[in-house]
Amino acid sequence: IPAPSIRLVPPYPSSQEDPIHIACMAPGNFPGANFTLYRGGQVVQLLQAPTDQRGVTFNLSGGSSKAPGGPFHCQYGVLGELNQSQLSDLSEPVNVSFPVPTW
């Protein structure tokens, strides 16, 4: 099933201590899906969208950037026939970068 779209949403972090907000949206066929956010291949957070919503926003607390590195990806799952979970393709990666200190 098609990959979700992923986007870093404001307010953008300016340091590793700032929270990170990442929106993940499934295509229109799949409202109410279960979403998983990955970083560097490891699960960071899981969220379920309400039944009338197509996406979720992951809110990662400050310091999350110190976790295993690499880009973020998200994925969603839906129940298919025989109540078996079907997983989407992974989203495109999204990288979080911080302004270079000017001192």
Partner: antibody, heavy 116, light 107 residues
Framework: QMQLVQSGAEVKKPGASVKVSCKAS????????FSWVRQAPGLGLEWMGW????????KYEQKFQGRVTLTTDSSTNTAYMELRSLRSDDTAVYYC?????????WGQGTMVTVSS | DIQLTQSPSFLSASVGDRVTITCRAS??????LAWYQQKPGAAPKLLIY???TLQSGVPSRFSGSGSGTEFTLTISSLQPEDFATYYC?????????FGQGTRLEIK
Amino acid sequence: QMQLVQSGAEVKKPGASVKVSCKASGYTFTTHAFSWVRQAPGLGLEWMGWISTYNGNTKYEQKFQGRVTLTTDSSTNTAYMELRSLRSDDTAVYYCVRDSRAFDVWGQGTMVTVSS
Amino acid sequence: DIQLTQSPSFLSASVGDRVTITCRASQGINSYLAWYQQKPGAAPKLLIYAASTLQSGVPSRFSGSGSGTEFTLTISSLQPEDFATYYCQQLNTYPLIFGQGTRLEIK
């Protein structure tokens, strides 16, 4: 090339029903939902409802609830919109749209005229 | 239900101008907003989805920004073919409401 081809224009009397078809080609039918949008002459876009080709679930704009039915037929890659109890203010162009991350493929529109 | 308000409703501009259209949502819709262009007698065309992602084949002079409740569509340098009506749409939650439209005309 992804394409949605709708059935032709209709003229109906008040109280009648209309069923508009929308045939999809150029992509896998069951991976994308459909929404239906209408546009009365000179006015804006009005979302009517949504149907999942994955499991058949539907959602309708409240003002159309009970008067509209959306269906799909995956054997012919076709979506349908039936609107009942037509009134003169239902006169509009009706669009089927592929509902993906947004409404990325639109049918050419079907003009439905309701007149006594 | 979520309401979307576009401003301005009507805009007069010249070829080469930079124009901005705003769409405000009555409650937060994350980044789940799309922009469409419609020319007379034609079906709408998707320009931008997820607030800022350019749909394939759309010229780069179109850009979108915003999150939460306030969004903008910017055309950096108007071309003759850009004179049309523009609609925003929220895709966060059902019903999938459209804004009332902004008509962009040649000055």
